[in-house]
């Protein structure tokens, strides 16, 4: 009996036309939502004038439906048993699941000012920037609507730059009508233990953002894993959102709508400094902000963001070193709300429920030539927002799963 079940599972998790896995893989049957909490700055003038701690108050959730579009350009390669695809991006605002509208205003760091002052280190250039910043009446902080902050707005300072430059700025700009990839993943036809594992991303096996093993594209995209998952496994996956591969470890058995699943979590060790976790040495890219690689819990992804000083962390700087959160008041990290987990059905390897949580931060540094940054006496890694992307298998799909998969085993 068990052998027959194994054979059936192996057949059905292959990523090719006609299998259960393929149908759900091309277009997820799960409704996926992305909730945003924006960090509204309460004391912008004090920070700019006196280099005070930044007082933030989170506002949210503002919820969008995401990942509702089917994979595009799905192409099988019989030679190397892979399938390639693009994952299109789309977001639809869900007012009924939100605390306000997309027109709600927030006081946030001026993204263009912070980024330009970081990228253009040259003092004379900073003097030119300063005159453009002043001329455009820009400051260290700005008031923006949710829609502007997420999806893009025309920046007044950048609009004065007399060179070819993208004047639209937004944390997720451009998003709608774009796609992530091309991904090329193993379809599992020749070897089921490789199913869904990424072979190449954007035509490469490495990212070119990091040194050594940190640069590798490991595992799947976390939507599924090869079947027959063991609790002892370390599940590797790649997340383009954070420009790196990461891993999850078993935490507990969970019952999800009558389906036994394994809860895998991202451990604090994955965010540790190289002092505590030597494997992380290659995620430390500079010595000053990282205090000689002793800081932890923030990931500098500037190389992946055209030099913009973007730092990724867990929400509220969960698992981050005290020096990171010290200049920010109003944060309350807790594991239950702010960690990432994957609930995986072990027989098929399918992720039936997940919560992906991350925080987007921007570095802002003092600049003696830029008036609005002149009074700063320290560097700040400023939280802009955090997000919670969740998906849970629907009741109908869960019934089908129970009857066709877990029910047959038990």
């Amino acid at each position: 009996g068990d052998l027959l079940i194994q054979k059936t599972i192996k057949k059905q998790v292959v990523l090719e036309e006609g299998t259960i896995a393929f149908k759900n893989w091309v277009k997820t049957g799960t409704e996926v939502y992305r909730q945003f909490w924006i960090f509204d700055v309460q004391n912008p003038q004090e920070v700019m004038m006196n280099s005070s701690n930044i007082q933030v108050k989170q506002r949210g959730p503002y919820t969008y439906r995401v990942r509702f579009l089917a994979k595009e350009n799905v192409t099988q390669d019989a030679e190397d048993n892979t399938v390639s695809f693009l994952q299109p991006n789309g977001a639809i605002f869900e007012p009924s699941l939100s605390v306000g509208t997309e027109a709600d205003n927030f006081t946030v760091l001026n993204l263009a000012v912070a980024a330009a002052s970081h990228i253009y280190q040259n003092q004379f250039v900073q003097m030119i920037l300063n005159s453009l910043i002043n001329k455009s009446k820009s400051s260290m902080f700005q008031v923006r609507t949710l829609r502007e902050l997420l999806w893009g707005y025309r920046d007044p300072f950048l609009s004065l730059v007399p060179y070819p430059v993208t004047t639209t700025v937004g944390l997720f700009y451009p998003y709608n009508n774009t796609a992530d990839g091309v991904y090329k993943v193993f379809n599992g036809k020749d070897n089921i233990s490789k199913v869904a594992i990424i072979d190449t991303y954007k035509g490469k096996r490495n990212l070119s953002y990091w040194e050594s093993h940190c640069d590798m594209i490991n595992g799947t995209d976390a939507a599924s894993f090869p079947p027959f998952v063991e609790k002892s496994q370390v599940l590797q996956f790649f997340s383009s959102d954070i420009c790196r591969s990461i891993y999850a470890v078993f935490e507990s058995d969970v019952n999800l709508k009558g389906i036994p699943v394994y809860r895998f979590v991202l451990p604090s060790k994955a965010f540790a400094s190289p002092v505590e976790n030597p494997d992380n040495y290659c995620f430390c890219t500079e010595k000053i902000i990282s205090k000689n690689c002793t800081s932890y819990g923030v990931l500098d992804i500037s190389k992946c963001k055209e030099g913009r000083p973007v730092y990724i962390s867990l929400p509220h700087f969960l698992y981050a070193s005290p020096d990171v959160s010290e200049p920010i008041d109003g944060l309350n990290p807790n594991e239950e709300e702010h960690r990432t987990y994957l609930d995986i059905e072990p027989i098929t390897g399918f992720t039936l429920q997940f919560a992906k949580r991350l925080q987007v931060n921007l570095l802002v540094k003092p600049s003696e030539k830029i008036q609005v940054l002149k009074n700063l006496k320290r560097n700040y890694i400023v939280p802009i927002l955090w997000l919670n992307e969740t998906g849970t298998i629907g009741d109908e799909k869960a019934n089908m799963f129970r009857s066709q998969v877990t029910g047959k085993i038990n």
Epitope: N122, Q123, F124, I128, L158, Y163, P164, V165
Partner: nanobody, 126 residues
Framework: QVQLQESGGGLVQAGGSLRLSCAAS????????MAWYRQAPGKERELVAG???????YYADSVKGRFTISRDNAKNTVYLQMNTLKPEDTAVYYC????????????????????WGQGTQVTVSS
């Protein structure tokens, strides 16, 4: 990789003139803003004059009316014409360059956006 090569320094009497040159090699986007700095013994390096590719110029108050910065975009070279030199102008003069805000900066120049020459000595005797 950007390289800056200065020339034209030397010993001159007070009231005399010198013309410094700085030739930049590498992508012109990476050196669109060019400037001259100087550092006198025991003092901090200070910005003397700067010029952007669009012609925006800056002069330190101490050199206004005496020094003129200019550039030849075709040769990717910047010049500093120094007239009515004073003993307090004695210093090592450094050529400096960097990109201005431009979409292709990170792709073409990488993470470094501040480039320096080796320096040329200017000595003004009284």
């Amino acid at each position: 990789q950007v390289q800056l090569q200065e020339s034209g320094g030397g010993l001159v009497q007070a009231g005399g003139s010198l013309r410094l040159s700085c030739a930049a090699s590498g992508d012109t986007i990476c050196t669109s803003a060019m400037a001259w700095y100087r550092q006198a013994p025991g003092k901090e390096r200070e910005l003397v004059a700067g010029i952007s590719s669009g012609g925006t110029v800056y002069y330190a108050d101490s050199v206004k009316g005496r020094f003129t910065i200019s550039r030849d975009n075709a040769k990717n070279t910047v010049y500093l014409q120094m007239n009515t030199l004073k003993p307090e102008d004695t210093a090592v003069y450094y050529c400096n360059a960097g990109p201005e805000v431009h979409d292709d900066v990170f792709r073409l120049c990488g993470p470094t956006t501040d480039y320096w020459g080796q320096g040329t000595q200017v000595t003004v005797s009284s």
